[in-house]
């Protein structure tokens, strides 16, 4: 027999989501207008393509990447889309209120949509650690809190450390990872007897997860270059990201084989490790002066990713209750840190080259930014975790974890679909 959504959630979710949507529509009505100064239609199309790449990454890439659970693939893809759609709307408003509001209305441009999509991507990275253990009503809360926290983090970093759009958005990797891990830590952990099979991966969903990884792999250069100011910086970012992800694919597949006693390749390792290079070079992709350096970083990132996938899941499963296949959280946390360290190293080398004695100060600023991102991620993640534990949301019972039938109508009601 199919599991029904608890009656209270059936009442609560549509009311909660539609009320929120109505509130967003009102906010858009009163406080926003479009940028009326678009002179160059060709330029508009080119600018839109970057946003389109980001949307493909978010909706298809991250949507399918998280769909590898045997009994939770539908929910993974659709809930991701739901969160993306809601997150983009709220992020556009929030960014506008934080950065432009004193001048009157919030002007919506393609750039603000680009920023908002990237902010929403943060939620899609974080949610990998909790998908299957929460319902849509809880995910709405998570979207609102995380987008708000990230928006404020970016605003604070921009004002205190004077970083540009690219630099303060590239903290997204570390922020999203630690946010997701701290939310997961707050949720009920043990999988009750008899439900262990649900968090296992299956062949078809694993294939769709690989499809997600491929989309992310193809579009990662767009993500890393989207907020850079000039064509030459974007060109550097695109090239360096491409070299890094290319090498991390080779490393992921060969490293995965190396890590297995029989030399077999793990799907889970590969899903995640193919993206390693893109995350690792994110912060400094426009600064890396030559391809070989980006390739070395891709290699190191791939090895770290495979190593992490081999040794960390046990710890994460015990402490955080994260299933073995949801390795994006700790993967991004390690690789995001690696990326920040690489940026600091490049900064030091640059400053030494200039011989201007600013090393200590620049490093201190960078460490300050990183620390702030981690602290805000942990604090807001814990707050979200506590909120999600409230009875009002009628969270799925642990026996119903990782089960599409809790949320979806399947006409045939096949148990082993």
């Amino acid at each position: 027999m199919s599991s029904k959504y608890p009656r209270s959630v059936r009442r609560c979710l549509p009311l909660w989501a539609l009320t929120l949507e109505a509130a967003l529509i009102l906010l858009f009505y009163f406080f926003t207008h479009y940028d009326a100064s678009l002179e160059d239609q060709k330029g508009l199309v080119a600018s839109y393509q970057v946003g389109q790449d980001l949307t493909v990454m978010a909706a298809i890439g991250l949507g399918f990447l998280t769909s590898s659970f045997r009994r939770h693939s539908w929910s993974s893809v659709a809930f991701n889309l739901f969160m993306l759609a809601l997150g983009v709307q709220w992020a556009i408003l929030l960014d506008g209120f934080l950065s432009q509001f004193p001048s009157g209305k919030v002007v919506i441009t393609l750039f603000s949509i680009r920023l908002a999509t990237m902010s929403a991507l943060s939620v899609l990275i974080s949610v990998d650690a909790v998908l299957g253990k929460v319902n849509l009503a809880q995910l709405v809360v998570m979207v609102l809190v995380e987008v708000t926290a990230l928006g404020n983090l970016r605003m604070v970093i921009s004002n205190i450390f004077n970083t540009d759009y690219h630099m303060n958005m590239m903290h997204i990797y570390v922020f999203a990872a630690y946010f997701g891990l701290s939310v997961a830590w707050c949720l009920p952990k043990p999988l009750p007897e008899g439900t262990e099979d649900k968090d296992q991966t299956a062949t078809i969903p694993s294939l769709s997860a690989m499809l997600g990884a491929l989309f992310l792999w193809m579009f990662w250069p767009s993500f890393n270059s989207a907020l850079l100011r000039s064509p030459i910086e974007r060109k550097n970012a695109v090239f360096n990201t491409y070299y890094a992800v290319a090498v991390s694919v080779v490393t992921a597949i060969s490293g995965s084989s190396l890590a297995h006693p029989q030399g077999k390749i793990s799907k889970t390792y590969v899903h995640s490790a193919v993206l390693a290079g893109g995350v690792a070079v994110g912060t400094s992709c426009h600064l890396i002066p030559s391809p070989w350096l980006a390739m070395v970083l891709g290699l190191v990132a791939g090895l770290i990713s495979v190593g992490g996938a081999k040794y960390l899941p046990g710890c994460c499963n015990r402490v955080l209750g994260i299933p073995h296949s949801s390795i994006m959280g700790y993967n991004f946390s390690l690789l995001g840190l690696l990326g920040e360290i690489i940026y600091i190293v490049l900064l030091v080398l640059d400053t030494v080259g200039a011989g201007n004695g600013m090393i200590g100060f620049q490093v201190l600023l960078s460490i300050g930014e990183l620390s702030l991102a981690i602290v805000i991620a942990l604090m807001s993640g814990l707050l979200t975790g506590l909120l999600l534990n409230l009875k009002i949301w009628k969270a799925p019972h642990e026996a119903k974890y990782f089960d599409d039938q809790v949320f979806w109508k399947f006409p045939h009601l096949a148990v082993g679909f």
Epitope: D35, D40, G43, L44, N162, R229, P289, D350, G353
Partner: antibody, heavy 126, light 106 residues
Framework: EVQLLESGGGVAQPGRSLRLSCVAS????????MHWVRQAPGKGLEWVAD????????DYADSVKGRFTISRDNSKNTLYLQMNSLRAEDTAVYYC???????????????????WGQGTMVTVSS | AELTQSPSSLSASVGDRVTITCRAS??????LNWYQQRPGKAPNLLIY???TLQRGVPSRFTGSGSGTDFTLTISSLQPEDFATYYC?????????FGQGTKMEIR
């Protein structure tokens, strides 16, 4: 020869509008961010607004935010500044300038204004 | 970041060595440029990134400094150097200029 040529200046009453244009020649505008900078008579330089190479992002000085709009048409190699609700304090020579991004030691990527137009005078007076 | 130039004006003779200073209200690393503006003309970029000479600018101009204190030095003033000099920061996207230093013939 690489150059920028502004036009559209003149006399306007407070509260009225003007639209400045800046045509680039000798280089492709689509490869560069652009700025407007102004200089009130006998005063120093004041940055007004900037726009990214693809027109995707714009920034404004607080003194003009909500009143001025920067835009560009890369197909016409032209930069614009739409000035609404003009005030007496907007009286100045307006220069367009090219945003040259250069990789500099210890500074990552740095902006400098390497090419300037000759300026166009805007007088706001009743 | 606000920039304060000193002196606001100075008198010098051809052949003199002169130094103009620019102080930022907060550290701006080396995100500082220097411009020269002759009367009735548009500004002209002299030095970027605090110390790098722009192509075509004579080597008598040198820039130095990092953090909050910067200097522009002209080793031997030439008649064409009598102009107004501005420093400008590109550390924040709200670019700011110093108030200018007017160089006059003594």
């Amino acid at each position: 020869e690489v150059q920028l040529l502004e036009s559209g200046g003149g006399v306007a009453q407070p509260g009225r509008s003007l639209r400045l244009s800046c045509v680039a020649s000798g280089f492709s505008l689509r490869s560069y961010g652009m700025h407007w900078v102004r200089q009130a008579p006998g005063k120093g330089l004041e940055w007004v607004a900037d726009i990214w190479f693809d027109g995707s992002n714009k920034d404004y000085a607080d003194s003009v935010k909500g009143r001025f709009t920067i835009s560009r048409d890369n197909s016409k190699n032209t930069l614009y500044l739409q000035m609404n609700s003009l005030r007496a304090e907007d009286t100045a020579v307006y220069y367009c300038a090219r945003d040259w991004r250069v990789r500099a030691f210890s500074s990552g990527w740095l902006s400098a204004f390497d090419i300037w137009g000759q300026g166009t005078m805007v007088t706001v007076s009743s | 970041a606000e920039l304060t130039q000193s002196p606001s004006s100075l008198s010098a003779s051809v052949g003199d060595r002169v130094t103009i200073t620019c102080r930022a209200s907060q550290s701006i690393s080396t995100y500082l440029n220097w411009y020269q503006q002759r009367p009735g003309k548009a500004p002209n970029l002299l030095i970027y990134a605090a110390s790098t000479l722009q192509r075509g600018v004579p080597s008598r101009f040198t820039g130095s400094g990092s953090g909050t204190d910067f200097t522009l030095t002209i080793s031997s003033l030439q008649p064409e150097d009598f102009a107004t000099y501005y420093c400008q920061q590109s550390y924040t996207t709200l670019w700011t200029f110093g108030q200018g230093t007017k160089m006059e013939i003594r």
